[in-house]
């Protein structure tokens, strides 16, 4: 069984306020089964940005078609970026259970927000 890896290729992404940010995440295996979630920040204060299991998340769309049964691309686009969105974003695989438990995390992508061009 191939060990699941979570690849967040971009260490950092810089976006102008008002634009959309694309945060890339791919996984290398579908197993163990369970949802992908995105968080801003780490630890108990982290903020849920996207959960494959539930929605909607009005400002967040998936870049690829996650309803494909073999999909391994969980990149997201966050629209209308503001300075409050700055931070490090983690793509995390959960293993199914009651409740689902965190299985593996990507290394994180730091989002910085530039001032809107005048």
């Amino acid at each position: 069984e191939e060990e699941l890896q979570i690849i967040q290729p971009d260490k950092s992404v810089s976006v102008a306020a008002g634009e959309s940010a694309i945060l890339h995440c791919t996984i290398t295996s579908l197993f163990p089964v369970g949802p992908i979630q995105w968080f801003r920040g780490a630890g108990p204060a982290r903020v849920l940005i996207y959960n494959q299991r539930q929605g909607p998340f009005p400002r967040v769309t998936t870049v690829s078609e996650t309803t494909k049964r073999e999909n391994m691309d969980f990149s997201i686009s966050i629209s209308n970026i503001t300075p409050a969105d700055a931070g490090t974003y983690y793509c995390i695989k959960f293993r199914k259970g009651s409740p689902d438990t965190e299985f593996k995390s990507g290394a994180g992508t730091e989002l910085s927000v530039r001032a809107k061009p005048s």
């Epitope: 579908l30 197993f31 089964v33 494959q52 299991r53 309803t67 494909k68 073999e70």
Partner: antibody
């Protein structure tokens, strides 16, 4: 109110074709994968085919591969099943079902009866 | 293939458990589907192993462990008489399968 309404069933002769339709309402059809499931008289449920939300990816059980084609028209909120070279073994009630994020089913149509008889 | 008992019976108010075996916990999610009469529309009572749709009474619950899933009806009622099909999605094959169904009789 979420609704799935199948149509297109009827009586056909062996070797003939039939196209089933499923009209969806009450949810954002283009965001969900969909499937067709059938139930032969006195038998259990049998999954036949699934299609991703955008329609680019399709999946079939081996016994209908090459004879049945699942498709969708998101602009019409409609799901289809084209059935060719029908045999008596295809006699069943055919249901369309909405898929959950992990390809189980949360809502079902009322079904449409297909009878293949000479 | 998914295996489940052909029939179970219970008195009103009792707890019923229906076990479905044959999947791989590592790659499989389970669901449970209620059909009150042959050819009528199935109703999803559990999906994703243990998730109950909002319109399903709380007496229905689901769990999964190892190679089996369990549907539990706590305080069964006469109106719960039906055939219950377990279903599974296997992420290895991209295929959905169903058990043969369990007829629940409430005495």
């Amino acid at each position: 109110d979420l609704q799935l309404v199948e149509s297109g069933g009827g009586v056909v002769r062996p070797g003939e074709s039939l196209r089933l339709s499923c009209a969806a309402s009450g949810f954002t059809f283009s965001s969900y994968a969909m499937s067709w499931v059938r139930q032969a008289p006195g038998k259990g449920l049998e999954w036949l085919a699934g299609i991703s939300a955008g329609g680019s990816d399709t999946y079939y059980i081996d016994s209908v591969k090459g004879r049945f084609t699942i498709s969708r028209d998101n602009s019409k909120n409609s799901l289809y099943l084209q059935m060719n070279s029908l045999t008596a073994e295809d006699t069943a009630v055919y249901y369309c079902a909405r898929e959950t994020w992990n390809h189980l089913f949360d809502y079902w149509g009322l079904g449409t009866l297909v009878t293949v008889s000479s | 293939a998914l295996t489940q008992p052909a029939s179970v019976s219970a008195n009103p108010g009792e707890t019923v458990k229906i076990i479905c075996s044959g999947g791989d916990y590592y790659s499989t999610y389970y669901g449970w589907y209620q059909q009150k009469s042959p050819g009528s529309a199935p109703v999803t009572v559990i999906h994703s192993d243990d998730k109950r749709p909002s319109d399903i009474p709380s007496r229905f619950s689901g769990s999964a462990s190892g190679s089996a899933a369990t549907l539990t009806i706590t305080g069964v009622r006469v109106e719960d008489e039906a055939v219950y099909f377990c279903g599974a999605y296997d992420g290895r094959t991209y295929i959905n399968t169903f058990g043969a169904g369990t007829t629940l009789t409430v005495l």
